[in-house]
């Protein structure tokens, strides 16, 4: 099983610990790291068959977006 905060969260627990600016939330080990360490999603071309993930969360947005609009990576969450 994974180590770290993911194993401590219930199914309906709040969003993960916010990341400071210039950090992104690593979904696979569930913690904040420097954004440059992650291979962020490639932007989709126009007309792709499914919605493209936005590449950053604005401070007022939440982590738990629907799968079609998952707003990740997550730099500087407040």
């Amino acid at each position: 099983m994974r180590r770290g905060p993911r194993s401590l969260r219930g199914r309906d627990a709040p969003a993960p610990t916010p990341c400071v600016p210039a950090e992104c939330f690593d979904l696979l080990v569930r913690h904040c790291v420097a954004c440059g360490l992650l291979r962020t999603p490639r932007p989709k071309p126009a007309g792709a068959s499914s919605p493209a993930p936005r590449t950053a969360l604005q401070p007022q947005e939440s982590v738990g977006a629907g799968a079609g609009e998952a707003a990740l990576p997550l730099p500087g969450l407040l």
């Epitope: 099983m1 993911r6 993960p16 979904l27 696979l28 790291v33 360490l37």
Partner: antibody
């Protein structure tokens, strides 16, 4: 674009050891997640483990005690050290790079390891 | 470990057919509103190729006849109109929890 080239496969006797290499180009192995996946002849895919940007490794529990993933950042190369090899470890071994969600979007061509006396 | 069960294990179909492959996880592979479920195609003697990631996102360069759907524990890969180059083995995979696991595969053969 990431390119991965595995090497080091071959014939080894039961109980022996082998080290596989995966030379990466197009991206630094200090970014993201770098996996080893194997496939026995005529069988499905089995995840061996990964090493990530920080050098942290995770393994398939069934293999952890015998297999070790490491890297040489100066050569941008990943390694899979396999010890105490058994006949059931005979497989094609692939290295693969994961995207942000863990999906493996870049794969090497694979290298065949045959464990037989 | 999360067990991934694909069905059917093999199927025979004709060019132009609509093909559906299902994958069921032994527990939810969703977290943060994301399904950590991916689909691959593999042809004999070749490395797997990523088709769909995050349950429904089409990988760059993959034809739009491939689509994925589902959430939680139940997922589907659909080929809307089977083409000759689609005869291959298809695998699902979860990356929600270590160890990452694959389904056993579904072989799509020519009828």
């Amino acid at each position: 674009e990431v390119q991965l080239v595995e090497s080091g496969g071959g014939l080894v006797q039961p109980g022996g050891s082998l080290r596989l290499s995966c030379a990466a180009s197009g991206d630094s192995i200090t970014r993201g997640y770098w996996n080893w996946v194997r496939q026995a002849p005529g069988k499905g895919l089995e995840w061996v483990g990964y090493i990530n940007y920080s050098g942290t490794t995770y393994y398939n529990p069934s293999l952890k005690s015998r297999f070790t993933i490491s890297r040489d950042t100066s050569k941008n190369t990943l390694y899979l050290q396999m010890n105490s090899l058994r006949a059931e470890d005979t497989a094609v071994y692939y290295c693969a790079n994961s995207n942000f969600y863990g999906a493996m979007d870049y794969w090497g061509q694979g290298t065949l390891v045959t464990v037989s006396s | 470990d999360i067990q991934m069960t694909q069905s059917p294990s093999s199927l025979s179909a004709s060019v132009g057919d609509r093909v559906t492959i299902t994958c069921r996880a032994s527990e939810s592979v969703d977290d943060y509103g994301i399904s950590f479920m991916h689909w691959y195609q593999q042809k004999p003697g070749k490395a797997p190729k990523l088709l769909i990631y995050r349950a429904s996102d089409l990988e760059s360069g993959v034809p739009s006849r491939f689509s994925g759907s589902g959430s939680g524990t139940d997922f589907t890969l659909t080929i809307s109109s089977l083409q000759p180059e689609d005869f291959a083995t298809y695998y699902c995979q979860q990356t929600s929890k270590d160890p990452w696991t694959f389904g056993q595969g579904t072989k799509v053969e020519i009828k």
